[in-house]
Interface confidence: medium
Amino acid sequence: FERTRSLQDPCSNCPAGTFCDNNRNQICSPCPPNSFSSAGGQRTCDICRQCKGVFRTRKECSSTSNAECDCTPGFHCLGAGCSMCEQDCKQGQELTKKGCKDCCFGTFNDQKRGICRPWTNCSLDGKSVLVNGTKERDVVCGPSPADLSPGASSVTPPAPAREPGHSPQ
């Protein structure tokens, strides 16, 4: 069947990196500069992606594969194949329409990208706050207040113990 198909369609013999040139009796012609074909039997070559502006070339275009871009320092990739670059912010910030803004009280972001997320509510799991949250870090939940009461099970209370939600002075 493959033999028959290739007799019927000479273009099927054209390998990746070439195209079937209708202007030249369907000869397999190499892809022109700055273009590629990643599969055989193609009638045209695709234009290579250009990594310009905020984009850097991670992988050069070849006759058989497209260029790949990543982002210049201070930016990170978004979207399939790094179709967009988004500005980094500092930890403890999020990107808004007005640029990088500090996380509101009660929220944190431990990365250079993404949004500020609320601190964990320890009490929902019956636990207490062991370490207070900051703009950059979530709270750390510890044993429940009951576990810290005298005569409770063998959980060793943290030293020094302090009221949930309050920083040591």
Epitope: C51, G53, V54, C69, L78, S83, Q87, K97, G99
Partner: nanobody, 122 residues
Framework: EVQLVESGGGLVKPGGSLRLSCTAS????????MSWFRQAPGKGLEWVSH????????DYADSVKGRFTISRDNAKNSLYLQMNSLRADDTAVYYC???????????????WGQGTLVTVSS
């Protein structure tokens, strides 16, 4: 096809001024935030400023705050950067960029101009 064309660059003495322009075509200019970026010789790309679609929200990098002013004329599909009190470290290729409509702060890879060179030297 989206096109962004910068102009207005050139050689200027320290303390001097320049006004960069960016003319946009191929998209509805009024729908998009727009940004200026710059790239100094041998350095990475640096965000300079951006402006919201209506021009009401504006932000600047600390390095240019108080010296540069971004503006836009939606009737002319144009973005501007007025640069005053120029210093040697402002020397760079300046690019305008269209920010992604879904999340300002992002830039789609084909939505960049080719840049205009600003050289600040005595």
């Amino acid at each position: 096809e989206v096109q962004l064309v910068e102009s207005g660059g050139g050689l200027v003495k320290p303390g001097g001024s320049l006004r960069l322009s960016c003319t946009a075509s191929g998209f509805t200019f009024t729908d998009y935030y727009m940004s200026w970026f710059r790239q100094a010789p041998g350095k990475g790309l640096e965000w300079v400023s951006h402006i919201s679609s209506s021009g009401t929200t504006i932000d600047y990098a600390d390095s240019v705050k108080g010296r540069f002013t971004i503006s836009r004329d939606n009737a002319k599909n144009s973005l501007y950067l007025q640069m005053n009190s120029l210093r040697a470290d402002d020397t760079a290729v300046y690019y305008c960029a269209r920010e992604d409509i879904r999340m300002p702060g992002t830039t789609d890879f084909d939505n960049w101009g080719q840049g205009t060179l600003v050289t600040v030297s005595s």
